[in-house]
C-alpha cells in the first residue's frame, strides 16, 4: 500500500478532531454505545485507524 | 451541523478541463483532511483525490498528473482540478470529509460529463 | 488494490424482515471496513465505521460483523426508508476501495 497520510497533531488543544483533542463540537466516529466525552475517535478504543491516518511523515 | 457543498460540475469535452469545488461549513475545516470520491453512472464508487491537513496529496494511478486536489482552509473550501478529461472521467463527484475511521461526512454530489 | 467483493448486488425483502449483506475482502483489512447509506436522491450516509461501530443517528435496527474476510451489515426489521442502496468501504490500504453495492428492494 501507499504509505500515506500526514497525522498533524496540533501543539495546542481546543481544536476538532484530533487524539486528546476530541471534544463535545466533534459529531462523527462516535458510537451510540459511548457518551460524548468518550468518542470512538479516541485511540484508546484501540480500532484500527484509516491508511490516511497511520503515518506521520 | 457538517455541511459539505459541492459546485462546478458540468458538460465538457474530452481533452478538457474543468474545476469543483466543495464548500465545508460546520466544523473547523483545517482540522480534517478531505477526499474527493465519485460514482460512474454504474454506480461504481472510486477514490479521487485525497488531502491532508498539511495539503499532503494523494491520489490513484486512475487520475494521477491529470487531477490536482487543494484546499484553502481560510475559505474553508476543497478544491479538485481535473484536466485531459476522459469519458471515463463521467461520474457524480462527492467530496467528503476525513477522520480515523476515513469518510464520515459526505456532500450533495456535483455531476460531470465528458463527451462530444 | 484489495478488492471488495460485495454481494447480493440486489435484494428483495419486506417490511420487518431481517437482512443482511455481504462483502468480502480479497486482503486482510482487520477492522477497517465502513458501510454506507445512498438515497435515491443521491446523499451519502455512513452507516458503521470500523466494522461494527454505529454512527451517531443511526438506528439500532442496523448493526454490522466479521467472520474472517467477510463482513456483514444486518438490519434487523426493515422498515421503508431501508429500502435504498448501501455500500462497503475498505480503508486499511491505499487506495481506497469500494464494494458494488446492494439495492434494497421492497418486495
Known amino acids: 500500500p501507499i504509505s500515506a497520510f500526514a497525522v498533524d497533531i496540533p501543539e495546542t488543544h481546543g481544536g476538532e478532531g484530533y487524539e486528546d483533542e476530541i471534544d463535545d463540537e466533534y459529531e462523527g466516529d462516535w458510537s451510540n454505545s459511548s457518551s460524548s466525552t468518550s468518542g470512538a475517535g479516541d485511540p484508546s478504543s484501540g480500532k484500527e485507524k484509516s491508511w490516511l491516518y497511520t503515518l506521520d511523515p | 451541523e457538517v455541511k459539505l457543498v459541492e459546485s462546478g460540475g458540468g458538460l465538457v469535452k474530452p481533452g478538457g478541463s474543468l474545476k469543483l469545488s466543495c464548500a465545508a461549513s460546520g466544523f473547523t475545516f483545517s482540522s480534517y483532511a478531505m477526499s474527493w470520491v465519485r460514482q460512474t453512472p454504474e454506480k461504481r464508487l472510486e477514490w479521487v483525490a485525497s488531502i491532508s491537513r498539511g495539503s499532503i496529496t494523494y491520489y490513484p494511478d486512475s487520475v494521477k498528473g491529470r487531477f490536482t486536489i487543494s484546499r484553502d482552509n481560510a475559505g474553508n473550501i476543497l478544491y479538485l482540478q481535473m484536466s485531459s478529461l476522459r469519458s471515463e472521467d463521467t461520474a457524480m463527484y462527492y467530496c467528503a470529509r476525513e477522520y480515523y475511521y476515513a469518510m464520515d461526512y459526505w456532500g450533495q454530489g456535483t455531476s460531470v460529463t465528458v463527451s462530444s | 488494490d484489495i478488492q471488495m467483493t460485495q454481494s447480493p448486488s440486489s435484494l428483495s425483502a419486506s417490511l420487518g424482515e431481517r437482512v443482511s449483506l455481504t462483502c468480502r475482502a480479497s486482503?486482510?483489512?482487520?477492522?477497517?471496513l465502513n458501510w454506507l447509506q445512498q438515497e435515491p436522491d443521491g446523499t451519502i450516509k455512513r452507516l458503521i465505521y470500523?466494522?461494527?461501530s454505529l454512527d451517531s443517528g443511526v438506528p439500532k435496527r442496523f448493526s454490522g460483523s466479521r467472520s474472517g474476510s467477510d463482513y456483514s451489515l444486518t438490519i434487523s426489521s426493515l422498515e421503508s426508508e431501508d429500502f435504498v442502496d448501501y455500500y462497503c468501504l475498505q480503508y486499511a490500504s491505499s487506495p481506497y476501495t469500494f464494494g458494488g453495492g446492494t439495492k434494497l428492494e421492497i418486495k
Open positions: 470500523a466494522t461494527s
Open positions: 486482503q486482510d483489512i482487520g477492522s477497517r
